[in-house]
């Protein structure tokens, strides 16, 4: 006699929404073997029994989780094989916050994995990566687990959030960090990853109270094409509303883009300039609040923007667009920025 189960594993992980067939068969020298599945929930799959075999079909619903047993008998001899079925949900639905990181700020980054099952800290792990390595010096805050709002009745899915406090990202800052979420199941390891871009700046604010010998200062060979004259600001070639950085967009290759800097002759005036050849024009397309409340002067390849009435520059995103081509440069001005005094 031979008793076979296919697939032969004693534990099987099934993705939610996918089906799986487990075939149990037995050959019998004297007559036909009797094979059947038992220990089945009424909801756990459907069984098709044939002479000498029985096929269990699992529909990939969360309620299909269980441990059915296949029993085969031939004459006075019987065999059995249990299969632990785990239905899991791990879609690529990672959400990170904030959408970008600002070097030089003490900040918390969060990473949420949505529509997860099982919601077990032992099977789901989070990591904050710099390149392929865990980010040294990050501090993991307490994880959170919440039930997702379900459109239909059934076993609930969960969202799990991990937060970290970030160490100083060093100078120059790395182009991006990554949140990596790993689900470890029997004989199966699944991983999703989401980028958290880091704004590049020529002059990152200094962390408070640092000493020269502090550990965990990260360095990166990536550099940004950024102009920051007099203002403690960050410019970034990218598309609105929030930049998605990659090592390539941080290099000086690629399309010719406008540059933003402070017009030193004009105190709080920002100047957007294009130097990509004749026929290029630039204009301001985004500013904190209402763009109409700013004073704008546009003259071909140059465009100026200033606050009305004259005062400190507002904190937030500024954007300048170049035509033809539509390339944009985004600029983030942090709050309480002190301009260079002009003589």
């Amino acid at each position: 006699q031979s008793f076979q189960v296919n697939p032969p594993e004693s534990e099987v992980a099934v993705a939610m929404g996918t089906s799986l067939q487990i075939t149990c068969s037995m050959s019998c020298d004297e007559g036909v073997a009797r094979v059947h599945w038992r220990g089945l929930d009424t909801s756990l799959g459907s069984v098709q029994t044939l002479p000498g075999s029985s096929i269990l079909s699992v529909r990939g619903m969360l309620s299909d989780t269980g441990t059915p047993v296949c029993v085969g008998s031939c004459g006075s001899r019987s065999f059995q094989h249990s299969v632990k079925i785990l239905v899991y949900a791990f879609p690529d639905q990672l959400v990170v916050s904030p959408e970008f990181l600002v070097p030089g700020q003490d900040q918390v980054v969060s990473c949420t994995a949505h529509n997860i099952w099982p919601a077990d800290p032992n099977s789901l792990s989070f990591a904050l990566l710099l390149g392929e390595q865990r980010l040294e010096g990050a501090q993991a805050l307490e994880p959170e687990q919440e039930e997702e709002i379900q459109e239909a009745e059934g076993t609930p899915l969960f969202r799990m959030t991990q937060r970290w406090r970030l160490p100083s990202l060093g100078t120059p800052a790395p182009p991006a960090l990554h949140c990596q979420v790993t689900m470890q199941l029997p004989k199966l390891v699944l991983t999703h990853r989401k980028e958290i871009p880091v704004l590049q700046s020529q002059t990152s604010p200094k962390p408070p109270n640092t000493t020269s010998a502090e550990p965990y200062i990260l360095t990166s060979s990536s550099t940004a094409e950024a102009v920051s004259t007099g203002l403690n600001i960050t410019t970034l070639p990218s598309a609105p509303p929030y930049p998605k950085l990659s090592p390539r967009t941080l290099s000086s290759e690629g399309p010719c883009r406008p540059k933003i800097h402070q017009d030193l002759e004009a105190g709080w005036e920002l100047l957007c300039e294009a130097s990509c050849g004749p026929g290029v024009t630039v204009r301001w397309t985004l500013a904190p609040g209402d763009l109409a409340t700013y004073h704008k002067r546009e003259a071909g390849a140059q465009a100026w923007l200033s606050v009305l009435p004259p005062g400190p520059m507002v904190e937030g995103w500024f954007q300048c667009r170049q035509d033809p081509g539509g390339e944009v440069t985004n600029l983030y001005v942090p709050g309480q920025v002190t301009p260079n005094s002009s003589s």
Epitope: G137, L166, P207
Partner: antibody
């Protein structure tokens, strides 16, 4: 000079409430996450709660969750711990401690205030 | 939660002795480990952070080493003012946890 000074401790009956304060001076209080750590008589140190500089993040040890509330008033440079439903096992010296930005160890501690829960 | 285990729980030593205290974490804490000194009736005082960095103002006879799960605090030449209880603390993840303490007594 950087200083933390706790107050508000005392004797309280089981089930009672107490509010501890921690007055900070010598540094920009709002830039720092702050902690409460306690030490029962003859025992080791137990972290019980933290609060971020802008009060946006708080967390508690399981032993006090649902009973204690941490808060801060940055305009007064003061950290608070509201303790409700006190139990005998909450008897301890309570310390406030400052958390070092970017590195996260507790670099400055107060002298402590004693809380005794007894009938 | 990450458990921190110190050894020994107490030790007797003489002035001038070299003293070593170990701390073991139940899982890796990288280098996110601090050592504190506490004298009776006083608040803890930070000695070492990031496993081996000496806090400003702390005498150089104190040193820390280790990473991952195994850490050591060494006092190269014990002084009279060093008799106290020493705690390790991991701050890699919450809840932050302390070792149970090592009491250094006069022999």
């Amino acid at each position: 000079e950087v200083q933390l000074l706790e107050s508000g401790g005392g004797l309280v009956q089981p089930g009672g409430s107490l509010r501890l304060s921690c007055a900070a001076s010598g540094f920009t209080f709002s830039d720092y996450w702050m902690h409460w750590v306690r030490q029962a008589p003859g025992k080791g140190l137990e972290w019980i709660s933290y609060i971020s500089g802008d009060s946006g993040y708080t967390n508690y040890a399981d032993s006090v969750k649902g009973r204690f509330t941490i808060s801060r008033d940055n305009s007064k440079n003061t950290l608070y711990l509201q303790m409700n439903s006190l139990r005998a096992e909450d008897t301890a010296v309570y310390y406030c401690a400052r958390d070092r930005p970017y590195y996260y160890y507790m670099d400055v501690w107060g002298k402590g205030t004693t809380v005794t829960v007894s009938s | 939660d990450i458990q921190m285990t110190q050894s020994p729980s107490s030790l007797s030593a003489s002035v001038g002795d070299r003293v070593t205290i170990t701390c073991r974490a139940s899982q890796s804490v990288s280098r996110s480990l601090a050592w504190y000194q506490q004298k009776p009736g006083k608040a803890p005082k930070l000695l070492i952070y990031a496993a081996s960095s000496l806090q400003s103002g702390v005498p150089s006879r104190f040193s820390g080493s280790g990473s991952g799960t195994d850490f050591t605090l060494t006092i190269s030449s014990l002084q009279p003012e060093d008799f106290a209880t020493y705690y390790c603390q991991q701050y890699k993840s919450y809840p932050v946890t302390f070792g149970q303490g090592t009491k250094v007594e006069i022999k």
